[in-house]
Interface confidence: medium
């Protein structure tokens, strides 16, 4: 799976979209999970309504919401009041039985609020040393990772 980078500004909302084949994934609930390290498990953050027919209803877990357009085939995740610790690697998932298919791998980058001068840095990355390949970007703000670019720079 390619990785799509979504950039948001600290303190603001970030909307992540995950398109999918609505016929292939018909009847399946969806989920948004956070990758714990490149090879680690994906920890569930929020999932769509328990009744698939009600997947269009927005469900919240803390500051993260999820809603699913099951006819159009678009899963939408909203990260409200984006914070530096929200930066990291996530997955949109399609659930079937005890298994989950990855719909999209997402790298969330948090940009500093340009009106907030308390921090000199302008971009927060997850504190991981691992890298991953085949990343590309959609603007939300979003961009493509260049070939060989490391989304998780080594921590000093």
């Amino acid at each position: 799976h390619n990785t799509t980078v979504f950039q948001g500004v600290a303190g603001q909302s970030l909307q992540v979209s995950c398109p999918y084949d609505s016929m292939k994934h018909w009847g399946r609930r969806k989920a948004w999970c956070r990758q714990l390290g490149e090879k680690g498990p994906c920890q569930r953050v929020v999932s769509t309504h328990n009744l698939w027919l009600l997947s269009f209803l927005r469900r919240w877990n803390g500051s993260t919401a999820i809603t699913d357009d099951t006819l159009g085939g678009t899963l939408t995740i909203t990260l409200r009041n984006l914070q530096p610790h929200d930066a990291g690697l996530y997955q949109c998932q399609s659930l079937h039985g005890s298994e989950a298919d990855t719909l999209r791998k997402v790298l969330v980058e948090v940009l500093a609020d340009p009106l907030d001068h308390r921090d000199a840095g302008d971009l927060w990355f997850p504190g991981e040393s691992e890298s991953f390949e085949d990343a590309h970007v959609e603007h939300s703000i979003s961009r493509s990772l260049l070939e060989g670019e490391i989304p998780f720079p080594p921590t000093s």
């Epitope: 016929m23 009847g27 609930r29 009744l51």
Partner: antibody, heavy 123, light 112 residues
């Protein structure tokens, strides 16, 4: 109307590869999961695996996974089964079937089946 | 894998009889989306299986009303309210809640 037709050799030698094709007509081929199922003579049904023609995604029965490949040719409305290193235990009637057309509350059952083709593994 | 167990493995009945076949799964068949993907198929000798009931209790198109399905969780039943001559066949339950899909061993309904 919806039709599925299996084709392929009826006799395969032990240790060789069994190859079957299912040709589909009468509906939007790329939007339903397609399955292979087999039935040894006088026995029950065994699911082999499935493929989604839209993107080629596959799932296999773990008991056969190391020997099975299911592929699709959307230009011909066909999907294929290859089963390697066959033995007499692979002698069966092989069926192709689609999952019930994806409509609200109606998915995940096999509504249309091919008539089946008997494959005998023997030297 | 989910194991499907049918009972009885065979039965003899007469035209007009009420016939009940049971199917038990080794784990719950409730999918994460709330649906239960338990289906029933009918197969006659030399023919491909035909879908009778999908998702526990929904009759497939063209299936006579004498066929009905019920159950939940792990225990399911197929009932033929009044057996007809064309109903003598083998019946299979099947689950598609989880891959790999699995079938029961079949119940053969024979003429008494």
């Amino acid at each position: 109307q919806v039709q599925l037709q299996e084709s392929g050799p009826g006799l395969v030698k032990p240790s060789e590869t069994l190859s079957l094709t299912c040709t589909v007509s009468g509906y939007a081929f790329s939007s339903s999961w397609m399955n292979w199922i087999r039935q040894p003579p006088g026995k029950g049904l065994e699911w082999i695996g499935r493929i989604y023609p839209g993107d080629g995604d596959t799932n296999y029965n773990p008991s056969l996974k190391s020997r099975v490949t299911i592929s699709v040719d959307t230009s011909k409305n066909q999907f294929s089964l290859k089963l390697s290193s066959v033995t007499a235990a692979d002698t069966a009637v092989y069926y192709c079937a689609r999952l019930l057309r994806n409509q609200p509350g109606e998915s995940y059952a096999m509504d249309y089946w091919g008539q089946g083709t008997l494959v005998t593994v023997s030297s | 894998d989910i194991q499907m167990t049918q009972s009885p493995s065979s039965l003899s009945a007469s035209v007009g009889d009420r016939v009940t076949i049971t199917c038990r799964s080794s784990q719950s068949l409730v999918h994460s989306n709330g649906y239960t993907y338990l289906h029933w198929y009918q197969q006659k000798p030399g023919k491909a299986p035909k879908l009778l009931i999908y998702k526990v209790s929904n009759r497939f198109s063209g299936v006579p009303s004498r066929f009905s399905g019920s159950g939940s969780g792990t225990d399911f039943t197929l009932t033929i309210s009044s057996l007809q001559p064309e109903d003598f066949a083998t019946y299979y339950c099947s689950q598609s809640t989880r891959v790999p899909y699995t079938f029961g061993q079949g119940t053969k309904v024979e003429i008494k």
